[in-house]
Amino acid sequence: AMHVAQPAVVLASSRGIASFVCEYASPGKATEVRVTVLRQADSQVTEVCAATYMMGNELTFLDDSICTGTSSGNQVNLTIQGLRAMDTGLYICKVELMYPPPYYLGIGNGTQIYVIDPEPCPDSDF
């Protein structure tokens, strides 16, 4: 299996945005790569978002996706937006080298993203 590295822990910003780098050790010269972000919480795994991209090009997520990303060589910089405290969990980066064959699959150990909902602003007296 292909090795995929990602940070162990990331803290989302107060605006509910978390970014992390997913890096894969490519055993071949892939031209088309698929990156999937999976969320593991309470032993359940769900797909957060996925994108297919040509090496050297931007990642294209679906229009309604909460993810955006950029690629550089064997690194993918992923950003997940709109996170709330209930979205805290382990976010796993899955990388597939699709074309040309052979196919390679790598799954990272996951990035624990902590999301803290901001305190509501106290009423101001004027």
């Epitope: 031209t31 088309e32 297919t52 699709m98 040309p100 064959p101």
Partner: antibody, heavy 118, light 107 residues
Framework: EVQLVESGGGLVKPGGSLRLSCAAS????????MAWVRQAPGKGLEWVSF????????YYADTETGRFTISRDNAKNSLYLQMNSLRAEDTAVYYC???????????WGQGTTVTVSS | DIQMTQSPSSLSASVGDRVTITCRAS??????LNWYQQKPGKTVKLLIY???RLHSGVPSRFSGSGSGTDFTLTISSLQPEDVATYFC?????????FGGGTKVEIK
């Protein structure tokens, strides 16, 4: 039910051109890579070309590079093969196939016959 | 290119017989070996992918085995409807290549 229906085959003179089409139904076309495979009369199967689901990746057999062009229109659920500079050895039944598993072709059309002859 | 050599090119067996078809790749193709069936005058159907996984709807009398360069398709009990030509295909490297085919007939 997955269905692939090829069309566009026929008789053409050497050096001529043809455009094959494949109409897909019964599955989400834009999720799958597609391939063309041909079979000369009384012969085995020969892979011709492949296009990935979003058309990012396109590949051809060496003998077809420069003469054939594979393309797809995901809005129309259609796959195409533009064949130029046709030769007698291109005479074959051309099958459209879905690449639903990495590098295996899980569903095939009935084929369309291309005959190159003067 | 990876060459795929199938044997035998044809065989004749009785209903109920165990039939074995072999496929040899010119280099290691890992588990990217698929088997297809083409009945006379019909289209091609995927039988087995990744060496041994049965495609949906394929009877369990069909099985695949092997590794690296040598692979086998087995029909445990030949049925009249199994009369067809069988092809192996490697998906390890482009161009994807097929074996020459094995024509199976009933005695």
């Amino acid at each position: 039910e997955v269905q692939l229906v090829e069309s566009g085959g026929g008789l053409v003179k050497p050096g001529g051109s043809l455009r094959l089409s494949c109409a897909a139904s019964g599955f989400t076309f834009s999720d799958y890579g597609m391939a063309w495979v041909r079979q000369a009369p009384g012969k085995g199967l020969e892979w011709v070309s492949f296009i990935s689901n979003l058309a990012y990746s396109v590949y051809y057999a060496d003998t077809e590079t420069g003469r054939f062009t594979i393309s797809r229109d995901n809005a129309k659920n259609s796959l195409y093969l533009q064949m130029n500079s046709l030769r007698a050895e291109d005479t074959a039944v051309y099958y459209c196939a879905r690449s639903g598993l990495p590098y295996a072709m899980d569903y095939w059309g009935q084929g369309t016959t291309v005959t190159v002859s003067s | 290119d990876i060459q795929m050599t199938q044997s035998p090119s044809s065989l004749s067996a009785s209903v109920g017989d165990r039939v074995t078809i072999t496929c040899r790749a010119s280099q290691d193709i890992s588990n990217y070996l698929n088997w297809y069936q083409q009945k006379p005058g019909k289209t091609v159907k995927l039988l087995i992918y990744y060496i041994s996984r049965l495609h949906s709807g394929v009877p369990s009398r069909f099985s695949g085995s092997g590794s690296g360069t040598d692979f086998t398709l087995t029909i445990s009990s030949l049925q009249p409807e199994d009369v067809a030509t069988y092809f192996c295909q490697q998906g390890r490297m482009l161009p994807w290549t097929f074996g020459g085919g094995t024509k199976v007939e009933i005695k």
